[in-house]
């Protein structure tokens, strides 16, 4: 896919970092959504992942930076192969494993 | 290889002040946060303030906001910790940190100094 | 504020593996860093971002998080592991970095 720029993967990262600092309660009601690979083009995945969970104000944002990182329209229901579909867990540990796989590829220079 | 190295520790008497400074190589400065860690004689760890790559964001532990201040000369790659009004209680060594990340709630500390002792008593 | 307990100490013999706890409320949601302290010597990063290790630290020590515990586990432990070891986090409530209490890791032998 093409490679987003850097502030809209900073920007990523300081979305995810401030939903997991400011859990107040559990995120989204603990809700569960599948678990993905986090390899090339786990913008799209993390996005179909998370565009399923409805009514949770926390992760709207993340959805919205997502889509712009996203090279083609993602829809709920929607799967691809980077999904681990025999795996499902919180939104919140979703977000916490994005972030921190983020953080490795910022370190690491790549933007992918 | 990253460095950093810390000066101006002394004994001061209380209420007097000192300026601390870490010299800071091997690595692009201004991309980075750093810190200000200090650690009392046979004593754990204590943050004492940490300041943003730019220097736009300070940060201050409670028992130090309003007597010390952080500032970073990022032209001089150094890092300073202007402190007054010194008790007995800010004896300790004091670390210069680097961040390892840009984001300031990510922070871990990759590099320290070797530390500078601070002495206050009378 | 945000509170980090550690043990004060854990002792272990050459061979064996040590664990070192860190609690914090909610801590599985916070990302843990711990350091090692050798007597006069500065901290050194020897796990960062939960269980990532940074370069030239062996892999014995390793990293986990979850719950109101993060743990530090230091497998086949060697007489050269005994320090004091401390584990810290950012609280975003206060905007202030936070250290654990530390926990002096003792080589029995």
């Known amino acids: 896919g093409p490679v987003p720029p850097s502030t809209a993967l900073r920007e990523l990262i300081e979305e995810l970092v401030n939903i997991t600092q400011n859990q107040k309660a559990p995120l989204c009601n603990g809700s569960m959504v599948w678990s993905i690979n986090l390899t090339a083009g786990m913008y799209c995945a993390a996005l179909e992942s998370l565009i399923n969970v409805s009514g949770c104000s926390a992760i709207y944002r993340t959805q919205r930076i997502l889509h712009g990182l996203c090279p083609h329209k993602v829809s709920a229901g929607q799967f691809s192969s980077l999904h681990v579909r025999d795996t499902k867990i919180e939104v919140a540990q979703f977000v916490k494993d994005l972030l921190l796989h983020l953080k490795k590829l910022f370190r690491e220079g790549q933007f992918n | 290889e990253v460095q950093l190295l810390e000066s101006g520790g002394g004994l001061v008497q209380p209420g007097g002040s000192l300026r601390l400074s870490c010299a800071a190589s091997?690595?692009?400065?201004?991309?980075?946060?750093m810190s200000w860690v200090r650690q009392a004689p046979g004593k754990g760890l204590e943050w004492v303030s940490a300041?943003?790559?730019?220097?736009?964001?300070?940060y201050y532990a409670d028992s130090v906001k309003g007597r010390f201040t952080i500032s970073r000369d990022n032209s001089k790659n150094t890092l300073y910790l202007q402190m007054n009004s010194l008790r007995a209680e800010d004896t300790a060594v004091y670390y210069c940190a680097k961040a390892d990340f840009w984001s300031g709630t990510l922070w871990g500390f990759d590099y320290w100094g070797q530390g500078t002792l601070v002495t206050v008593s009378s | 504020s945000y509170v980090l307990t550690q043990p004060p100490s854990v002792s272990v013999a050459p061979g064996q593996t040590a664990r070192i706890t860190c609690g914090g409320n909610?801590?599985?949601?916070?990302?843990v860093h711990w350091y090692q302290q050798k007597p006069g010597q500065a901290p050194v990063l020897v796990v960062y971002d939960d269980s990532d290790r940074p370069s030239g630290i062996p892999e014995r020590f390793s990293g986990s998080n979850s719950g109101n515990t993060a743990t530090l586990t230091i497998s086949r432990v060697e007489a050269g592991d005994e320090a004091d070891y401390y584990c810290q986090v950012w609280d975003s409530s206060s905007d202030h970095v936070v250290f654990g209490g530390g926990t002096k890791l003792t080589v029995l032998g």
């Open positions: 091997g690595f692009t400065f201004s991309s980075y946060a």
């Open positions: 300041i943003s790559g730019s220097g736009g964001s300070t």
């Open positions: 909610n801590i599985g949601n916070k990302i």
